[in-house]
């Protein structure tokens, strides 16, 4: 059985989550990829996705989420900027591969965002923010909606213990309520 494991990040409000999801180059380089949140007792919800086909090194910005797919590295880079306490939750990268079910990339990210001062005295906070002043991408394609009889009806427990699952291709039903809102001028 494939284990679903979690990696935990505890960050402060205003900081940036910056993670990379590794994928098989030959199989998935141009496949559409997505960033999802899994709330307790709910289906995974798609927050942002790359274009289809996914473009190399082309940033897609959805609100405070920035996705960049690096085909030459086999990595999807996900950044969530200006984090808020409400962003706390369990996240995952998936690859869309219709008509098959989405393929989950390991590991899931347990994000904990707390209130408080995010830097140290004299820390250069502005320099981190400047990195993300990229023009937002306008793409017409929304993330696909999947329905399947093998739906996940319960989110995994909040503990960081391993959770067994029958195979690595977890079925994920995704929503399409994505609004691309530019947040940087």
């Amino acid at each position: 059985a494939t284990k679903l494991t979690e990696e935990k990040y505890e960050l402060k409000e205003g900081q940036t989550l910056d993670v990379k999801c590794d994928y098989t180059l030959e199989k998935f380089a141009s496949s559409q990829k997505a960033w999802q949140i899994i709330r307790d007792g709910e289906m995974p919800k798609t927050l942002a996705c790359t274009e289809r086909p996914s473009k190399n090194s082309h940033p897609v910005q959805v609100g405070r989420i920035i996705l960049e797919d690096y085909h030459d590295h086999g990595l999807l880079r996900v950044r969530m900027v200006n984090l808020q306490v409400e962003d706390s939750g369990l996240y995952q990268c998936v690859i869309y591969q219709p008509p098959k079910e989405p393929h989950m990339l390991f590991d899931r990210i347990r994000l904990v965002v707390t209130k408080g001062f995010s830097g140290t005295p004299g820390s250069n906070e502005n320099s981190t923010q400047n990195v993300y002043k990229i023009p937002p991408t306008t793409t017409k394609a929304l993330c696909p909606l999947y329905t399947s009889p093998r739906t996940v009806t319960q989110a995994p427990p909040k503990s960081t213990a391993d959770v067994s699952t029958p195979d690595s291709e977890i079925n994920l039903t995704n929503v399409t309520d994505i609004i691309r809102v530019p947040v940087f001028n």
């Epitope: 505890e10 900081q15 993670v19 999801c21 590794d22 590295h73 086999g74 390991f106 590991d107 400047n130």
Partner: antibody, heavy 119, light 108 residues
């Protein structure tokens, strides 16, 4: 329990070759990037090379590029470092390290294997 | 290449006292920074990652803070087992992944 065990170190003359191995257990090896990190006697840590899990992408420090080759055999749960054209300054303890899935930080380390390059 | 600079090189502290170690990056690394502890004859051990997240099994007396270019590792009350060398490491963008030169925490 996660375990990483390096082997293959030893003494070699400048210009010579060595192949280091790192046998791992306790986690799904094929899913994670792995790195080699070295430490010269009495000195600090220096990242040497990385091989990603799913993509198989490889990266090298400038100091070893063209001389060292990282590889892995997922069926044997083993990471390798082929070191050619060795120099005196390559003398160090070589550690293999497991990386986080989501970033290149090293959450588990082997005990290291000593490579001595001397004439 | 991002250069990591740690200070001081050596820190002399009495057991029970507070220790504050600094790490500076030559350019912003967001919060993509880790701290490691290394004792003589042993491999490094991950303490903190993401600048402030404690790794599994690390005592609460270890805490990390900072963002951008300036980072701090604080040991609130030094225990005998905490005397060691501490390294910071950035994992921002792409390799090479670079370490600071280390700070040795010794008994005063």
């Amino acid at each position: 329990e996660v375990q990483l065990l390096e082997s293959g170190g030893g003494m070699v003359q400048p210009g010579g070759s060595l192949r280091l191995s790192c046998a791992v257990s306790g986690f799904t090896f094929s899913r994670y990037a792995m790195s080699w990190v070295r430490q010269a006697p009495g000195k600090g840590l220096e990242w040497v090379s990385e091989m990603r899990g799913s993509s198989g992408s490889t990266y090298y420090a400038d100091s070893v590029k063209g001389r060292f080759t990282i590889s892995r055999d997922n069926s044997k749960n083993t990471l390798y470092l082929q070191m050619n054209s060795l120099r005196v300054e390559d003398t160090a303890i070589y550690y293999c390290a497991k990386e986080f899935s989501s970033n290149s930080l090293f959450d588990y380390w082997g005990q290291g294997t000593l490579v001595t390059v001397s004439s | 290449e991002i250069v990591m600079t740690q200070s001081p090189a050596t820190l002399s502290v009495s057991p029970g006292e507070r220790a504050t170690l600094s790490c500076r990056a030559s350019q912003s690394v967001n919060v993509n920074l880790a701290w490691y502890q290394q004792k003589p004859g042993q491999a490094p051990r991950l303490l903190i990652y993401g600048a402030s997240t404690r790794a599994t099994g690390i005592p609460a007396r270890f805490s990390g803070s900072g963002s951008g270019t300036e980072f701090t590792l604080t040991i609130s009350s030094l225990q005998s087992e905490d005397f060691a060398v501490y390294y910071c490491q950035q994992f921002y963008n792409w390799p090479p992944w670079t370490f600071g030169q280390g700070t040795k925490v010794e008994i005063k």
